[in-house]
């Protein structure tokens, strides 16, 4: 690891469209990239009436939005397609949804965020 950060060398691979794309459905994907670039894992999923449907998992390009994230967490509020990325081998095995709450005014009542979904 460089400067203590976890280098991503492989990620959990999944492709829901594996038949159409003629790929494996699941497996482990080695992550390649230029020496000066960081590599990440990602997961993409949908929430269909409360049921989690994974779209893709695998390696992701050098992306500042993924830096130093050991957990794969989607923070956008209710996206149509959920996405998270992280650093560290196989860090995309588990993923969660934990939207950041927009605080407009301080309140004495604590706000409970929506529960996360896990693979």
């Amino acid at each position: 690891a460089i400067l203590g950060r976890s280098e991503t060398q492989e990620c959990l691979f999944f492709n829901a469209n594996w038949e159409k794309d003629r790929t494996n459905q699941t497996g482990v994907e080695p992550c390649y990239g230029d020496k000066d670039k960081r590599r990440h894992c990602f997961a993409t999923w949908k929430n269909i009436s409360g049921s989690i449907e994974i779209v893709k998992q695998g390696c992701w390009l050098d992306d500042i939005n993924c830096y130093d994230r050991t957990d794969c967490v989607e923070k956008k509020d209710s996206p149509e397609v959920y996405f998270c990325c992280c650093e560290g081998n196989m860090c995309n095995e588990k993923f969660s949804y934990f939207p950041e709450m927009e605080v407009t005014q301080p309140t004495s009542n604590p706000v409970t965020p929506k529960p996360p979904y896990y693979n």
Epitope: N15, N17, D21, T23, Y32, G33, W60, P79
Partner: antibody, heavy 120, light 107 residues
């Protein structure tokens, strides 16, 4: 320095065949996905085909499926596009382009292109 | 296939102007969105990938934003070398598809 050099373009009659090559240098070719993208004269970009780092996964645009075949020879650092049953609408500049993974295909390096003209 | 629609198809601007190009996907593509710049007679060049990440060597005046179906490429202060055609591209699903392009011309 990453370099991609296409060759094999030229004039061919409708129904004919051509094989394009893309010679890669300056990076570990066997670690990257590769793609062919074309651009008809005065038009936009159209993805033609893609292949992952070891040739295990291949994908094609519907417009070329069954006629074009993408392949690679990692020992020669070369990408190929075999084009059969060529049509006038296949006339374009063909670019090879590198991508990191099959599913996050930002095409980060491109060759200079080779012109394919299909005409009688 | 996912359709990518760019607007405007062309625009005229002056050096120093702020320029915004939009790209709309026919379905949600999360952040699988890239932008390219192409100059006449040259190959396209990757500018922005994964919506917001600048490719190596791309000046900070280029920025990307958006998510889901609506995306924007912004050039904060147009420079002479920025006059070119810009394309968006989705990599959420195969086949990869590009927008029709936006030609940025000198006013």
């Amino acid at each position: 320095e990453v370099q991609l050099l296409e060759s094999g373009g030229g004039l061919v009659q409708p129904g004919g065949s051509l094989r394009l090559s893309c010679a890669a240098s300056g990076f570990t070719f066997s670690s990257y996905g590769m793609n062919w993208v074309r651009q008809a004269p005065g038009k936009g970009l159209e993805w033609v085909a893609g292949i992952n780092y070891n040739g295990g996964y291949k994908g094609y645009a519907d417009s070329v499926k069954g006629r074009f075949t993408i392949s690679r020879d990692n020992s020669k650092n070369t990408l190929y596009l075999q084009m059969n049953s060529l049509r006038a609408e296949d006339t374009a500049v063909y670019y090879c382009a590198r991508s990191a993974n099959w599913h996050d295909t930002a095409l980060d390096y491109w060759g200079q292109g080779t012109l394919v003209t299909v005409s009688s | 296939d996912i359709q990518m629609t760019q607007s405007p198809s062309s625009l005229s601007a002056s050096v120093g102007d702020r320029v915004t190009i939009t790209c709309r996907a026919s379905q949600s593509i999360s952040n699988y969105l890239n932008w390219y710049q192409q100059k006449p007679g040259k190959a396209p060049k990757l500018l922005i990938y994964a919506v917001t990440s600048r490719a190596s060597g791309v000046p900070s005046r280029f920025s990307g934003s958006g998510s889901g179906t609506d995306f924007t490429l912004t050039i904060s202060s147009l420079q002479p070398e920025d006059f070119a055609t810009y394309y968006c591209q989705q990599s959420y699903d195969s086949p990869l598809t590009f927008g029709g392009g936006t030609k940025v011309e000198i006013k």
